[in-house]
């Protein structure tokens, strides 16, 4: 390893040697901040090297060939600790016949543009000008690691210095830290930790809940295989090198569990046969929700207590429960599952469906003429209670009278009491078609199948009734 000893360029207090303190460079009248130099007169003897030389084609007035130009040797490898200051330089003596020369600094093949910590100083003599390009970093970081070179352009020729390799040493630096994980109880999993120097080697110790896991360190990178956990644990890794140790972030390893039940359920909307609910899922147990189950049972204490189950996807936390009875009370519970299992059911909530229009027509509709022949009597049976879908408020009767060239429809409303009605004969020698619908506050139900009766001309008497059969009596 080459020591960080500067190559003596000039006797006396000239700058240009390696400095690791923060004293400023000697400021001379010709010093300038990182800019091209204009050159004049005679040469200063140095120690040219054979690599990266340019043989200038220009000759003096006496046509004597000029010596090859090259940067002088300087320190090749500087090792220092993070946050320390460093200064290094390259120097060259250039015959004054060359004009407009520039020195630029490059790091790892990329030019360091606008670097405020580079300074170029010129020391003109009769025949040559000594140029010293200094580069200083006040507080080195790892990112300053690399190979630095000077480049000089003269007459389209490029002169390149030997590289100066800067090695910043410090505490280990993590390139891969363990990650938080959600794991299944008693199931093995791996954690990875990787750290780099310099200096190398870097050794890894693993820590679980503040206690070291491995007695002997492992060389970085290290993979820790945990055979399984029964409860949450915090893992970290320690990276050690000659400079000291660095501790990674602590990561929590959670044990997957069944989820918590939802924290809220909302009844968004109710209709006669459906209830729209939404819910806020509880804690997911460190495992994504897969689906949810809505359990519905009739709240009526006389019901048989059977539970309807509706399964749905976990998202969007919204479900329309369908196929419900109208004007009924229900208890609803929501449960969700992840890969481990189902949550408990949420507390049971109450919801009601609204009234709807009856879903079936009145049954067993019978129509006949009464003795006076001035009226038509209609009788029916109310729809089954379960299909009334609400509280019956009455019936709507449609009667259509048809005779040659005439058709006339009339609608009548009758109260809910009883199951008979009487309508006046509108036209003789005509057919009367009767249909009846049940009515609730939720609306008008379907009309019954038509029942027809012929109304004879005056003087005819036909008492035979017409009817629609009740279901099962056909």
């Amino acid at each position: 390893r080459e020591e960080a000893k500067p190559y003596p360029l000039f006797p006396g207090p000239f700058p240009g040697s390696l400095q690791t303190d923060h004293t400023p460079l000697l400021s001379l009248p010709h010093a300038s901040g990182y800019q091209p130099a204009l050159m004049f007169s005679p040469t200063q003897p140095g120690r040219p090297h054979t690599g990266n030389v340019a043989i200038p084609q220009v000759t003096s007035v006496e046509s004597k060939p000029l010596p090859p130009l090259a940067f002088k040797h300087t320190v090749g490898h500087i090792i220092l600790s993070e946050h320390k200051g460093v200064k290094f330089n390259c120097s060259i003596s250039v015959p004054n016949i060359y004009q407009d020369t520039t020195i630029s600094w490059w790091k790892d093949g990329k030019e360091l543009l606008g670097a405020h910590h580079a300074i170029t100083q010129f020391y003109p003599d009769d025949e040559v000008t000594a140029i010293i390009a200094s580069f200083s970093i006040t507080s080195v970081q790892r990112s300053d690691n690399g190979s630095y070179i000077c480049k000089m352009k003269i007459n389209n020729e490029e002169i390149v210095s030997d590289p100066i390799y800067i090695e910043v040493q410090g505490l280990p630096h993590f390139t891969k830290q363990p990650e938080s994980m959600n794991v299944t109880r008693n199931t093995a999993f791996n954690l990875t930790c990787q750290a780099v120097g310099p200096p190398e080697p870097v050794n890894i110790f693993w820590v679980q809940n503040s206690s070291r896991v491995n007695e002997q360190p492992e060389k970085s990178p290290s993979v820790l295989t945990v055979p399984g956990l029964t409860e949450m644990a915090v893992f970290s890794c320690e990276a050690h090198n000659d400079k000291g140790l660095t501790v990674s972030k602590g990561v929590q390893i959670n044990i997957k569990a069944i989820p918590s039940p939802p924290t809220e359920v909302s009844i968004r909307n109710s209709t006669a046969h459906s209830i729209l609910i939404s819910w806020v899922p509880g804690f997911d147990g460190y495992s994504p929700f897969r689906n949810c189950s809505i359990q519905v049972k009739e709240a009526d204490p006389l019901s048989n207590g059977s539970v309807m189950i509706f399964n749905t996807s976990a998202l969007p936390h919204l479900y329309q429960i369908k196929q419900l009875q109208a004007l009924a009370n229900y208890s609803i519970g929501v449960s969700c599952m992840n890969e481990i299992g189902w949550s408990a059911v949420s507390p049971w909530i109450l919801a009601s469906t609204t009234e709807g229009a009856p879903s079936v027509a009145p049954l067993n509709v019978t129509v006949f003429l009464n003795e006076s022949s001035d009226n038509v009597d209609i009788r029916w049976m109310k729809p089954p209670t379960k299909q009334q879908d609400g509280e019956l408020v009455g019936y709507r009767i449609s009667h259509v009278w048809q005779s040659a060239g005439i058709s006339k429809e009339l609608l009548e409303e009758v109260g809910q009491n009883g199951s008979r009605a009487r309508i006046s004969v509108q036209v003789h020698n005509a057919t009367c078609t009767v249909r009846i619908a049940a009515v609730t506050r939720g609306g008008v139900g379907p009309f019954s199948d038509p029942v027809k009766i012929f109304i004879p001309a005056h003087g005819w008497v036909d008492y035979a009734p017409s009817s629609t059969p009740a279901p099962g009596n056909a």
């Epitope: 039940p261 939802p262 924290t263 809220e264 359920v265 909302s266 009844i267 968004r268 909307n269 109710s270 806020v280 899922p281 509880g282 804690f283 208890s331 949420s346 507390p347 049971w348 909530i349 109450l350």
Partner: antibody, heavy 128, light 111 residues
Framework: EQQLVESGGGLIQPGGSLRLSCAVS????????MSWVRQAPGKGLEWVGI???????YSASWAKGRFTISKDSSKNTMYLQMNSLRAEDTAVYFC??????????????????????WGQGTLVTVSS | DAQLTQSPSTLSASVGDRVTITCQSS????????LSWYQQKPGKPPKLLIY???DLASGVPSRFSGSGSGTEFTLTISSLQPDDFATYYC???????????FGGGTKVEIK
């Protein structure tokens, strides 16, 4: 660790305003309804109001118009804005997490099932 | 507004005693069972003991139990321990109303 911390209490003159805060840690306000409950010195508990996870608020009938509950989910903090304060509002004000809540959106009310986590409380003294 | 009435308001008992506190509601509690019991010690916030009238909250000792439905509820401590001297509150909600009602409290003190 799941925790609730109230702040903002103090001495205030009658007619004045005060805003209490409830800082939540260990769980999210976007997943839980929250409630305020108060307790006058030497007296029992009195419910003030609730804010659901979606931000709907419901207040005790006596608090409507003077007390407003709000929250900032990004800060995981709930607030109680108290205006036109009176001497009888002197109490320790607790924030509490609602373990389960049912909302009846169509009818604009909701029901608390239980309050399963409480803060230590902050004392509000209304006095001239 | 619905009201919850606790009795007694104060109860003197000794360690090891069986203690019963009742809570009566002026109308049926939501779902007949959405009633909770809370324990509060001086200078401390309340702590949930029982919910759904009879379900023990997490970490609550089994000597505490609850029962009842509709409008009548009971909290029982089967064998009073020194740590149980405190004030107990019942609370519940009602259909059609957002108000969460608390009972007046029962102070259990050392005899």
């Amino acid at each position: 660790e799941q925790q609730l911390v109230e702040s903002g209490g103090g001495l205030i003159q009658p007619g004045g305003s005060l805003r209490l805060s409830c800082a939540v840690s260990g769980f999210s306000l976007s997943s839980n309804a929250m409630s305020w409950v108060r307790q006058a010195p030497g007296k029992g508990l009195e419910w003030v109001g609730i804010i659901s996870s979606s931000g709907s608020t419901y207040s005790a009938s006596w608090a409507k118009g003077r007390f407003t509950i709000s929250k900032d989910s990004s800060k995981n903090t709930m607030y109680l804005q108290m205006n036109s304060l009176r001497a009888e509002d002197t109490a320790v004000y607790f924030c509490a997490r609602v373990g389960f809540f049912v909302g009846y959106g169509a009818y604009d009310y909701g029901i608390i099932h239980r309050l399963d986590l409480w803060g230590q409380g902050t004392l509000v003294t209304v006095s001239s | 507004d619905a009201q919850l009435t606790q009795s007694p308001s104060t109860l003197s008992a000794s360690v090891g005693d069986r203690v019963t506190i009742t809570c009566q509601s002026s109308k049926s509690i939501y779902n007949n069972n959405w009633l909770s019991w809370y324990q509060q010690k001086p200078g401390k916030p309340p702590k949930l003991l029982i919910y759904d009238a009879s379900d023990l909250a997490s970490g609550v000792p089994s000597r505490f139990s609850g029962s009842g439905s509709g409008t009548e509820f009971t909290l029982t401590i089967s064998s009073l321990q020194p740590d149980d001297f405190a004030t107990y509150y019942c609370a519940g909600g009602y259909s059609g109303d957002s108000d969460y009602a608390f009972g007046g409290g029962t102070k259990v003190e050392i005899k």
